[in-house]
């Protein structure tokens, strides 16, 4: 059962796993949610009746029954983790805590103009978990405007104390606001020889990399595969760090793989969700339950639905035994990973999918692409929406993309002459325009947010957000697309598609069926040569065939240029302007979304 509200002046008795320090009960709940075992917590707020050494303590708790006895205690705030909830979860915490000093290892001290600048510095520093900033009113002159970057083993403060005229806050890496590079490559036959901060068991290098990503101190990792010569180290995932933030030594070793934390790209690739099955593999751990199940998929469902289950092993039924049902072993451990991994015993193992909700919805795999043809099929581009105007008569105006459950990203030039959001309708999950009848459900638009530097499409800043009046329930036919990571600026996308209902050739009419075209990206230098009378800025991206014939067309404005990278679709561009409909050999020009990620997040996460 999902319980989101906090219980004031209430303490849960017993079940303690560990104690951490958090600046608020709300953040304590987030820490509990991300902890592999925590189901409940008790936070102690500052209060004259409480011992100051207990202020800001966040006690993480577990219980076999998923609840604990409640005791009245002033200044105690208790609650449940969001593990039990089905809604999207984020570790992003933009709050600034006034007059609080969050203690940790102060590894960097520098002058900053503001707390915001200090927070940005922390976000762009690979080691930084949180910061404390002494304001210009701070009593000690030499400490004024000093920005202290801090880290700890757990990623949370070692203590929090009251201190006048300072502010503290957390790194915004988990808000997708870091400019740090996003290095997705896994290097085969490589060992990073740096200090280990932790080690866990993992079935493959990908899971090892994801574990590294959500471990607060891990910057890179080395994984020993099941063919590694030393038996005791097989399937061992070593979580590593270094002072420079990069591996100091790379050693060539067969059957080892190494890679980097994906913390700078975690909003656009799955890092919590280990969805694969591992055949002929047994995961060992504390046994929670043994249940009969028809298949390993059914076993994974059982594990996902059991809130304390972290991983499972399924042993298929022996012929005609137990109505063809096998045994499903639901398991857990102190850190969420198997205590040992064994091969060759015939089991099929995997992880709970409960943690998938901690990943961005946009990372969910969608149905395979239909190869060839120009007409799309249902569910192929579930983020694509058709934006209609009802004035003077109802018609398709522009395309757009779902980027959040209340947000559509589109082009600013679509709203020329649009006086009010009241005349707009957003239809999602649509394949054919002919499906749209008077009784077809749509989303009303609450607000049109146009970039304040927008003048005309050709000059750039051709980007706008639509805030919907109601939220989108994600389904197979309507779900968000990931924004590109700022750390991905140097990625070369090779699988890009433009979609829309727009004209296919000049003076054509709107298409009934959603059209698609695979188009290659063109360098800005090449694009500039093709548009000699227009400045192609770094905030634009170009795409189109040299031979022409495939390009976005009028009516596709505002729609997505979607590129698949590492199995995840990213909204790389917004159809903006260009020489009409591939009749000339000019690429289409798109708004370069990665350059507007900060703007998008600022507008969509504004309170």
């Amino acid at each position: 059962e999902c319980v989101t509200q906090l219980l004031k002046d209430t303490c849960f008795e017993g079940g303690d796993i560990t104690t951490v320090f958090t600046p608020s009960a709300k953040y304590c709940q987030v820490v509990c949610t991300y902890h592999p075992r925590c189901l409940l917590f008790t936070f102690t707020a500052e209060s004259p009746s409480e011992d100051p050494t207990r202020w800001f303590t966040c006690v993480l708790k577990d219980s076999v029954t998923e609840t604990l006895p409640r005791v009245n205690r002033t200044a105690a705030i208790s609650g449940y983790s969001f593990k039990q909830c089905s809604h999207q979860i984020s570790a992003c915490n933009k709050d600034i805590y006034v007059d609080l000093d969050m203690k940790g290892i102060n590894y960097n001290s520098s002058v900053a103009k503001s707390a915001q600048e200090c927070q940005e510095r922390c976000t762009d520093d690979v080691h930084c978990h949180f910061f404390t900033y002494a304001t210009r009113q701070f009593p000690s002159l030499e400490h004024r405007n000093i920005c202290l970057l801090k880290h700890t083993q757990t990623g949370t403060p070692t203590r929090i104390t009251k201190l006048d005229k300072v502010v503290s806050g957390f790194s915004l890496k988990s808000c997708a606001l870091s400019n740090l590079a996003c290095i997705r490559d896994i290097f085969p036959n490589t060992v990073f020889a740096d200090s280990n901060i932790d080690s866990v068991m993992a079935p493959d290098a990908f899971v090892c990399g994801r574990i590294c990503t959500h471990h607060p101190g891990c910057l890179f990792f080395t994984f020993f595969s099941q063919e590694w010569p030393k038996e005791s180290q097989r399937n061992l995932c070593l979580l590593k760090t270094s002072e420079s933030g990069l591996p100091s030594t790379r050693i060539k070793k067969s059957k080892a793989l190494s890679g980097f934390s994906l913390q700078s790209c975690r909003h656009s690739i799955p890092v919590f969700c280990h969805s694969s099955f591992y055949h002929d593999t047994d995961f060992l751990g504390e046994e929670l339950d043994i249940v009969a199940a028809k298949s390993h998929e059914a076993c994974q469902k059982l594990c996902t639905n059991a809130v304390r289950c972290q991983f499972f092993t399924y042993t298929p039924a022996q012929a005609s035994c137990n109505e063809g049902k096998g045994k499903c072993y639901l398991k857990l451990s102190s850190n969420g990973s198997p205590t040992k991994i064994l091969h060759g015993r015939g089991g099929i193992s995997g992880y709970t999918l409960r943690l998938c909700k901690m990943d961005n919805e946009c990372t969910t795999k969608i149905k395979p692409r239909i190869v060839g043809g120009t007409a799309s099929v249902r569910g192929e581009w579930p983020w694509q929406v058709t934006l209609h105007t009802t004035s003077p008569t109802q018609r398709h105006l522009c395309g757009g993309s779902i980027i959040g459950n209340q947000w559509i990203l589109t082009a600013a030039h679509c709203f020329y002459g649009v006086e009010s959001p009241k005349i707009l309708r957003v239809y999602s999950g649509i394949l054919n325009q002919s499906e749209i009848k008077e009784d077809t459900s749509f989303f009303g638009v609450q607000e049109i947010i146009i970039h304040d530097q927008y003048k005309m499409a050709e000059s750039g800043y051709d980007i706008a957000l639509l805030k919907l009046e109601t939220t989108v329930n994600y389904t197979d036919s309507q779900r968000p697309i990931c924004l590109p990571s700022k750390g991905d600026r140097n990625v070369i996308y090779t699988d890009c598609w433009v979609t829309g209902w727009g004209y296919r050739k000049l003076r054509d009419k709107i298409q009934n069926t959603l059209q698609k075209a695979k188009i290659p990206l063109v360098t800005n230098e090449e694009c500039q040569k093709r548009y000699r009378g227009h400045k192609i800025t770094h905030k634009m991206i170009c795409a189109g065939y040299r031979e022409g014939g495939k390009d976005a067309c009028k009516g596709d404005s505002g729609g997505p240029l979607s590129c698949k990278h590492n199995e995840v679709w990213h909204l790389v561009g917004i159809t903006s302007w260009g020489e009409g409909c591939a009749q000339r050999e000019r690429p289409g020009v798109y708004t370069n979304v990665v350059e507007y990620v900060d703007w998008i997040l600022e507008k969509t996460q504004a309170v």
Partner: antibody, heavy 120, light 107 residues
Framework: QVQLVQSGAEVKKPGASVKVSCKAS????????IEWVGQAPGQGLEWMGV????????NYNENFKDRVTMTAHTSISTAYMELSRLRSDDTAVYFC?????????????WGQGTLVTVSS | DIQMTQSPSSLSASVGDRVTITCKAS??????VAWYQQKPGKAPKLLIY???NRYTGVPSRFSGSGSGTDFTFTISSLQPEDIATYFC?????????FGQGTKLEIK
């Protein structure tokens, strides 16, 4: 109908500057690019640069980059090309032309040309 | 920059003759090729754009063809008023460049 009318012939001394005007009529001036093309006596055509009157963006040929300035006044639908530090080999007819497409392309309307003679 | 090499540089033909001028680009210019006619003391006039599209009001005896790097301009039946210099131009990549011109005379 579309027309581009250029200013009259000029005689200049080496080292001086010349400013040629090109007044457009018969179309939406801001919506099309204006190109400038030079033609030395008995020679071929050489593109000097382009101005986008709508945005004011200019793009110059490397050969002229440090000596040419193109401007446009949309209120009077007039484009200008100024060439500085004139040399005797700048003696040429200078044409303004409108592009056929909004984003570039062939030049469908041309001014009558302005002869600039550089002589000491 | 893309070079446009035009040939011949001059040619003499009789009224009614079929006249062909070729233009070779130093790299592919796709379909972004135009042809102009210039009479002495006048501005060039656009005849053909996108390789083969005749501009408004241009007589049907003028045509263009080709692809990639090789392009041809043809006058199917030469008329006395066609005496002029003809230029090809690529518009594929900035800076746009012109051929050196073909001077057409009547025999």
């Amino acid at each position: 109908q579309v027309q581009l009318v250029q200013s009259g012939a000029e005689v200049k001394k080496p080292g001086a500057s010349v400013k040629v005007s090109c007044k457009a009529s018969g179309y939406a001036f801001s919506n099309y690019l204006i190109e400038w093309v030079g033609q030395a006596p008995g020679q071929g055509l050489e593109w000097m640069g382009v101005i986008n009157p709508g945005s004011g963006y200019t793009n110059y040929n490397e050969n002229f980059k440090d000596r040419v300035t193109m401007t446009a006044h949309t209120s009077i639908s007039t484009a200008y090309m100024e060439l500085s530090r004139l040399r005797s080999d700048d003696t040429a007819v200078y044409f303004c032309a409108r592009t056929y497409g909004k984003y570039g392309g062939a030049m469908d309307f041309w001014g009558q040309g302005t002869l600039v003679t550089v002589s000491s | 920059d893309i070079q446009m090499t035009q040939s011949p540089s001059s040619l003499s033909a009789s009224v009614g003759d079929r006249v062909t001028i070729t233009c070779k680009a130093s790299q592919s210019v796709s379909n972004d090729v135009a042809w102009y006619q210039q009479k002495p003391g006048k501005a060039p006039k656009l005849l053909i754009y996108y390789i083969s599209n005749r501009y408004t009001g241009v007589p049907s005896r003028f045509s263009g063809s080709g692809s990639g790097t090789d392009f041809t301009f043809t006058i199917s039946s030469l008329q006395p008023e066609d005496i002029a210099t003809y230029f090809c131009q690529q518009d594929y990549s900035s800076p746009p460049t012109f051929g050196q011109g073909t001077k057409l005379e009547i025999k």
